[in-house]
């Protein structure tokens, strides 16, 4: 059948999901497309336990997640409800700050150096994390 039981090569399994951690940086939209091209999505954090898992793997580095408010309200890329879901913003965040001088506000969420979340300019080249549910992940190793 089409159901998968293993994560792809170079992905990390955790609680029935597979995670992939970048080592380079991209703008949020490019990171989003990268994950989608891998049949995945930018990471959606649904619990404190998942937050700690991701935080452990990324370390103290700004890293994009699958949360944005580019069309108004905050939305998770997989449709998970934002209002009732897990949140871990830094104090006073999100603030849609316009003072950066880059035009517009701040519409994309990232993990900061302490793991808490901040909204920032989506064009900034941050690292990113992809996630896919285990039964959607390919178990076939890529032929390099």
């Amino acid at each position: 059948g089409s159901e998968r039981t293993c994560c792809p090569v170079n992905w990390v399994e955790h609680e029935r999901s597979c995670y992939w951690f970048s080592r380079s940086g991209k703008a949020w939209a490019d990171a989003d497309n990268y994950c989608r091209l891998e049949d995945a999505h930018l990471v959606v954090v649904t619990s404190w336990e998942e937050q700690k898992f991701v935080q452990h793997h990324i370390g103290p580095v700004n890293t994009w997640m699958g949360l944005h408010d580019q069309n108004g309200p905050w939305k998770w890329v997989d449709g998970t409800d934002y209002e009732t879901g897990f949140k871990n913003w830094r104090p006073e965040q999100p603030d849609d700050w316009y003072g950066h001088g880059l035009g517009g506000g701040e519409d994309c969420a990232h993990f900061t150096d302490d793991g808490r979340w901040n909204d920032d300019v989506c064009q900034r080249p941050y690292r990113w994390v992809c996630e896919t549910e285990l039964d959607k992940a390919s178990q076939e190793p890529p032929l390099l």
């Epitope: 490019d30 990268y34 091209l37 891998e38 049949d39 890529p142 390099l144």
Partner: antibody
Framework: EVKLLESGGGLVQPGGSLRLSCAAS????????MSWVRQAPGKGLEWVSA????????FYADSVKGRFTISRDNSKNTLFLQMNSLRAEDTAVYYC????????????????WGQGTLVTVSS | DIQMTLSPSSVYASVGDRVTITCRAS??????LAWYQQRPGKAPKVLIY???SLQSGVPSRFSGSGSGTDFTLTISSVQPEDFATYYC?????????FGGGTKVDIK
Amino acid sequence: EVKLLESGGGLVQPGGSLRLSCAASGFTFSSYAMSWVRQAPGKGLEWVSAISGRGGNTFYADSVKGRFTISRDNSKNTLFLQMNSLRAEDTAVYYCAKRGFRFLEWLGGFDYWGQGTLVTVSS
Amino acid sequence: DIQMTLSPSSVYASVGDRVTITCRASQDISNWLAWYQQRPGKAPKVLIYAASSLQSGVPSRFSGSGSGTDFTLTISSVQPEDFATYYCQQGNSFPLTFGGGTKVDIK
């Protein structure tokens, strides 16, 4: 040996439709994103569309969005491009291309290309 | 969209000459750049990926360099089979975009 073989090209009138196919062999097809790239006569290369390995996500150039649909059948190792509302400016050789170097953190370069199939849109 | 500009559009060389082709991106693409060779009537063939990595089976006379917005492809000593058209392509963002092509012709 990786092989990509396109078919389905031909002469079609403006406003008409055509479906291109690309038969793949020599690699684990479902593990790789695939793209269509075209080349108008005497012109350069233009990326048209891409699809993820399992087919869940698709991407298009603005010039074909809403008219072309990329799809794949992993059980048959085949890539497709459904082209509707064709225009004269769609006249080109259409190549299917395999996303290469997956260990890189990029959206793609292409390590293998088919030989191409010619699509001519003319009345 | 990211524009890719190749220069020159054509270059004339003799066998044994050193040829350098330049590709400029309209915005930073890190090192996410590939170079292709296309002979008349044939499909493109990848030469260089990630700006400077030589594809397996490609002669070592081909080399690539650069990062950010400025990249070069160098053929250290042109051989008869190298007379062809060369393209750069950025792989950082959708839509993927190619430079317009540089034709290397016999002088």
